[in-house]
């Protein structure tokens, strides 16, 4: 899901910093300092070079741009705005570049941008208009098809006084710009919940990765609108049980494959419907690997092997009969 390049030959630039005053704009085919360029592969790689800003002299032919492993810190408005525009840039990988702030309009003037990877950046401040570029209620549609936001949660002491989930969702929903998004990866972000409106407003999604978060429940999440959804990754969360409404919605999606491994399933009476569903459904991949975590007597039991007699709940005693 990240930009890749062919094995075409790469030309390296001279090893000096591009900070000289220029009387004219860069030649369209020159390679920025500290980068490698292949015009044949339409690829520029500025990788692990401790760059503190996006090079100004990117060649106009660039289709795949790797800016990984740098120290960009802030991605300002128009970070990739050039004259002429980078009209061919389709895949942009900014992973692991110590970004902590992405400002409104950071990706403006990239008309062909299909893939964007911001993974492994501690994004304490992601503008609501980072992807839409406008504070209009309905923005011009973004060309983005894949948005990779794995492990973008900042350390706890660097987070703003607001919900991290809310900040990310605001950026995803602003101006309804991402209506064409097909792949969204949000793995490893310590998400405790999924705001209920997010999926309804991303109707084109084919692939959604929410693995390795801290999701406890999907009760308020609706998958009903995601009729094109093909894969839903929920592995390594804190899910205890999936309730009937969620099961029915997932079953109703025509192309779906769901991944549920490594969740702490609670095998009590509330699990009965899910077990019944698991035995019948084809949508869960590796369903034979799902095991109970609680209660203690059920630990490591395979969900598919349970029957209703196994799934009991301790009776709730009236207050007068409870002991301390």
């Amino acid at each position: 899901s990240s930009p890749t390049s062919s094995a075409s030959s790469f030309s390296s630039s001279a090893p000096f910093l591009a900070s000289a005053v220029s009387a004219q704009p860069p030649l369209p085919d020159q390679c920025p300092a500290l980068c490698e360029c292949s015009e044949a592969a339409r690829t520029v790689k500025c990788v692990n070079r401790n760059l503190t800003e996006v090079p100004t002299d990117l060649p106009a032919y660039v289709r795949n741009l790797f800016l990984t492993g740098n120290q960009l810190a802030v991605l300002p408005a128009g970070a990739f705005a050039r004259r002429p525009p980078l009209a061919e840039l389709a895949a942009l990988n900014l992973s692991g570049s110590r970004l902590d702030e992405v400002r409104a309009g950071a990706f403006e003037h990239l008309p062909s941008l299909r893939q964007l990877d911001l993974s492994h950046n501690p994004l304490a401040d992601l503008s609501p208009f980072a992807f839409s570029g406008s504070n209009a209620s309905v923005s011009a549609p973004s060309p983005l098809v894949e948005l990779i936001l794995n492990h973008i949660v900042p350390p706890e002491d660097e987070r703003q006084n607001r919900s991290f989930e809310g900040m990310v969702v605001a950026a995803l929903l602003a101006g309804r710009a991402l209506q064409g998004l097909r792949r969204l990866e949000l793995a490893s972000n310590h998400f405790l919940y999924l705001p209920r409106d997010v999926l309804a407003q991303l109707p084109s999604l084919r692939h959604l990765d929410l693995s390795n978060n801290s999701l406890v429940s999907l009760t308020y999440v609706s998958f009903r609108n995601l009729t094109h959804l093909e894969s839903l990754h929920l592995e390594d969360n804190a899910l205890k049980v999936l309730h009937n409404g969620t099961l029915a919605e997932l079953q109703g999606l025509p192309h779906i494959r769901v991944f549920l491994d490594n969740n702490p399933w609670v095998c009590d009476c509330h699990m009965a419907d899910m077990v019944t569903w698991l035995k019948e459904t084809e949508v869960v991949q590796g369903k034979d690997r799902l095991t109970c975590a609680y209660p203690e007597k059920m630990r490591n039991r395979v969900l598919l092997e349970l029957n209703s007699a196994d799934l009991d709940c301790d009776p709730i005693l009236p207050p007068s009969l409870q002991t301390s």
Partner: antibody, heavy 121, light 111 residues
Framework: EVKLLESGGGLVQPGGSLKLSCAAS????????MTWVRQAPGKGLEWIGE????????NYTPSLKDKFIISRDNAKNTLYLHMSKVRSEDTALYYC??????????????WGQGTTLTVSS | DIVLTQSPASLAVSLGQRATISCRPS??????????IHWYQQKPGQPPKLLIK???NLESGVPARFSGSGSGTDFTLNIHPVEEEDTATYYC?????????FGAGTKLELK
């Protein structure tokens, strides 16, 4: 309120030099690209050049790059245009201008009132 | 450099009628999402005023009787209905590449 105030124009002899200034106020000058545009009497607009916020990138129109130098002093909120070897065809009203966004300019929302340079012997 | 050919050089329009000004760049100045043409109005003794950016986006505070259209190498500024205060010179500008360039201008007068 954004304000741009050009100064330094006047009468100069052919071959002489002059430095125009543009004092900016009402915004964070150090964040914005700034631009010079000129207009000869009764003629159209001509883009002279631009300078980025930290002065690392300066672009000129090709025909003027050998005689004009654009600079800025962010501490003084001032943009400069240093003109040398001026000729009669440099007689014009000189405007400084600013875009509404803080990256390289595509268009100009804010303009000064201009300062007039007259080149004559 | 990109040359912007503006036409007509001048036109006279009756109050309430439509004024149409053309701007033709010497090469395409459009991507799939933006056209890098902008329109300005200049009245005597005043600096230019931005009317329209990116070919068709009306600048804040500009009356809705101004509109822009076009892509590639063919752009149009329309004013309808023309009002007395619209007497001015109109310029197009491209920001596709450096150097930025302006059209020669179109002078609009009232009949």
């Amino acid at each position: 309120e954004v304000k741009l105030l050009e100064s330094g124009g006047g009468l100069v002899q052919p071959g002489g030099s002059l430095k125009l200034s543009c004092a900016a106020s009402g915004f964070d000058f150090s964040r914005y690209w700034m631009t010079w545009v000129r207009q000869a009497p009764g003629k159209g607009l001509e883009w002279i050049g631009e300078i980025n916020p930290d002065s690392r990138t300066i672009n000129y129109t090709p025909s003027l790059k050998d005689k004009f130098i654009i600079s800025r002093d962010n501490a003084k909120n001032t943009l400069y245009l240093h003109m040398s070897k001026v000729r009669s065809e440099d007689t014009a009203l000189y405007y400084c201008a600013r875009p509404d966004h803080d990256y390289n300019p595509y268009y100009f929302n804010y303009w000064g009132q201009g300062t007039t340079l007259t080149v004559s012997s | 450099d990109i040359v912007l050919t503006q036409s007509p050089a001048s036109l006279a329009v009756s109050l309430g009628q439509r004024a149409t000004i053309s701007c033709r760049p010497s090469q395409s100045v459009s991507t799939s999402s933006n056209s890098y043409i902008h329109w300005y109005q200049q009245k005597p003794g005043q600096p230019p005023k931005l009317l329209i950016k990116y070919a068709s986006n009306l600048e804040s505070g500009v009356p809705a009787r101004f509109s822009g259209s076009g892509s590639g190498t063919d752009f149009t500024l329309n004013i309808h209905p023309v009002e007395e205060e619209d007497t001015a010179t109109y310029y197009c500008q491209q920001s596709w590449e450096i150097p930025l360039t302006f059209g020669a201008g179109t002078k609009l007068e009232l009949k």
